[in-house]
């Protein structure tokens, strides 16, 4: 059953035994209570009782799944890829029907020679993985094929793959212009018809760490953001320390709420701390401010 419980927190105890005071604000939090048999577990926010403890859904944790994590695991792919659909016309081979059959001796031989030729053409492109013939048709031999590119994931992967696709275009244009038949014969490994070279389509892996971060943060999506460290993206809330966006709570504890990150200020034996960043200290005996 879905219930709305008014939460009014006035103080928390820190690990040193001091009190953390918070304004008494009524935050109406939707709470899902999971009941298993006679066990009413109070697993909130979609969490479920596994018989021993609450199993929380991202981005929640805690005994009752009532707290919000400071960072969410996002896993970019190890590598990202691009696929270019190209067509070239090979003039140094006469088309025969056997070339349509991918298990024929003719197709296998053509595939081997074409792959060898393309490996030479694209040898200077570090992202180049290989080619895959999708169709052969009459005219001398029209070769519909995919050029496969791959690179390690970095924040700039799209630029790297875009650059690689441009180099592929340049190189295939160059070879199909230079390796042409002379006196009805070819002196290269393969010869081409210059006008038969076309780039039909380019598909690049779509991975957006910001999108993944926002999706996993759910209703806290506006408060989680992506920061990079060693080219790796981290999905963090301002309560996660050590990042540019980290909130400095000084004499307090950072806590996420549905209104964003806020500081819960501590009260020590000698001071009350207040202010948005808990940086205003008031001495209990003298009542004057330290900034």
């Amino acid at each position: 059953p879905l219930a709305t419980i008014p939460v009014s927190t006035t103080s928390l105890t820190s690990s040193e035994g001091s009190t953390i005071s918070t304004p008494s604000v009524d935050i109406s939090t939707p709470v899902t209570t999971s009941i298993v048999g006679d066990q009413c577990s109070r697993c909130k926010n979609g969490g479920f009782w596994d018989g021993l403890k609450c199993q929380c859904l991202t981005p929640y944790y805690g005994e009752s799944c009532e707290e919000v994590v400071n960072s969410i695991d996002i896993a970019p792919p190890e590598t990202v890829s691009a696929q270019m659909e190209l067509t070239v016309t090979v003039t140094s081979v006469k088309f025969t029907d056997e070339l349509k059959n991918h298990s024929s001796q003719e197709f296998r031989e053509f595939n081997k020679t074409f792959t060898e030729q393309m490996n030479i053409v694209y040898s200077g492109i570090p992202e180049y993985v290989g080619v895959n013939i999708t169709n052969l048709r009459l005219g001398s031999v029209v070769v519909e094929h995919d050029v496969l590119l791959r690179t390690k994931y970095t924040p700039e992967y799209k630029t790297a793959l875009d650059n690689a696709t441009e180099v592929v275009k340049q190189k295939i244009t160059k070879v199909t212009t230079e390796q042409i038949m002379t006196n009805d014969n070819c002196s290269a490994l393969m010869c081409f018809n210059t006008t038969g070279t076309q780039v039909q389509n380019i598909t690049v892996t779509q991975y957006d760490p910001v999108e993944e971060c926002r999706q996993k943060a759910e209703e806290y999506e506006d408060y989680f953001l992506v920061e990079y460290r060693d080219q790796k993206p981290y999905c963090i809330s301002p309560c996660e320390s050590g990042f540019n966006a980290s909130k400095n709570c000084n004499h307090g504890k950072c806590q996420m709420s549905q209104n964003g990150a806020r500081c819960l200020c501590v009260t020590t034996e000698t001071h009350w701390y207040s202010g948005e960043d808990c940086n205003q200290g008031t001495q209990k005996s003298h009542h004057h401010h330290h900034h």
């Epitope: 140094s92 006469k94 056997e98 001796q105 020679t113 038949m181 014969n185 070819c186 393969m190």
Partner: nanobody, 124 residues
């Protein structure tokens, strides 16, 4: 796989004749390309002639035109090179090459199947 075995090489005087043979096996079709290449010591392998076994195409290098004749016997799956008016510069190792494709290339790298070669020496 395709197997090629050459024969017919030997020593011959300038102006003489020789007939080379190349027996092919392992083809799944009766329409393919066969060629003769040669390689003299210290030189690159070069095309002599090629033929499509369906009779659609023959090619001769300029240096052998009018003196050499390439032919193919479909019933025997055998390639021949009739060499007449032999010259000292024809001395080389002669190789039979084949492709399951109908090739129009004189680049040896485009030809996947090769025989072991037969030596032709033209000397007085």
């Amino acid at each position: 796989d395709v197997q090629l075995v050459e024969s017919g090489g030997g020593v011959v005087q300038p102006g003489g004749s020789l007939r080379l043979s190349c027996a092919a096996s392992g083809y799944t079709s009766n329409r393919y390309s066969m060629a003769w290449f040669r390689q003299a010591p210290g030189k690159e392998r070069e095309v002599v002639a090629f033929i499509w076994t369906d009779g659609g195409r023959t090619y001769y290098a300029d240096s052998v035109k009018g003196r050499f004749t390439i032919s193919h016997d479909n019933s025997k799956n055998t390639l021949y090179l009739q060499m007449n008016s032999l010259r000292a510069e024809d001395t080389a190792m002669y190789y039979c090459a084949a492709s399951s494709l109908l090739l129009q290339t004189i680049n040896p790298r485009a030809w996947p199947y090769w025989g072991q070669g037969t030596q032709v020496t033209v000397s007085s």
